[in-house]
């Protein structure tokens, strides 16, 4: 079994991207919910 690297100087960039995507999708869901609620 190969070991994991102890150092990755760019992994945080992907994590940041995932967090942005998550935030964006939450924002979009909240907006969709607002539109549905407003139309009731």
């Amino acid at each position: 079994d190969n070991p994991s690297l102890s150092i990755d100087l760019t992994f945080h960039l992907l994590r940041t991207l995932l967090e942005l995507a998550r935030t964006q999708s939450q924002r979009e869901r909240a907006e969709q919910n607002r539109i549905i609620f407003d139309s009731v």
Partner: antibody, heavy 113, light 112 residues
Framework: EVQLQQSGPELVKPGVSMKISCKAS????????MNWVKQSHGKNLEWIGL????????IYNQKFKGKATLTVHKSSSTAYMELLSLTSEDSAVYYC??????WGQGTLVTVSA | DVVMTQTPLSLPVSLGDQASISCRSS???????????LHWYLQKPGQSPELLIY???NRFSGVPDRFSGSGSGTDFTLKISRVEAEDLGVYFC?????????FGAGTKLELK
Amino acid sequence: EVQLQQSGPELVKPGVSMKISCKASGYSFTDSTMNWVKQSHGKNLEWIGLIHPDNGGTIYNQKFKGKATLTVHKSSSTAYMELLSLTSEDSAVYYCANGFAYWGQGTLVTVSA
Amino acid sequence: DVVMTQTPLSLPVSLGDQASISCRSSQSLLHSNGNTYLHWYLQKPGQSPELLIYKVSNRFSGVPDRFSGSGSGTDFTLKISRVEAEDLGVYFCSQSTHVPLTFGAGTKLELK
């Protein structure tokens, strides 16, 4: 020991596309990012982008979008960079760099008619 | 894009001298996670760049303790306490805080 073995030098004609490979060994390939870097004129370094082998997630330098495509083949622990529609401006040495820490030996690409 | 400005571009030294290279970034390299992703590489003639110092001041495995890094925010320094023949080559600073990652133009450490 971490090793990144890149494919050999290429002499290609303008307009064609080509793929460079980077075979990784000595560590768990799917655990860390693979970066690609261009070095032209023996000095100037430019980051092309990165890929995470586990999920295929990529981040590109806007400058290289449409020029480079990054992929991986998990079962052979190999990363690939395809360079599209080559011009003389693409003549350079290209490096893969795992985690931006361990670098391959470089692949010289020469674009000439 | 973050511009990395290295000085000097050429640094003539004698063996045993102390050498110092400066790197300035056009914006802060402090990431929201608390890390500063400023790194130093050495490229010897005909070879690939090799990592010396990562995240400002951490020596990479196998790097001699005559190499040290310091700085914060936008202002960083690499010091070599006693230059040896194997240290000659081109030194690059680089940042991986912001996309796209960027490099300095390089500092050539050469003999006087």
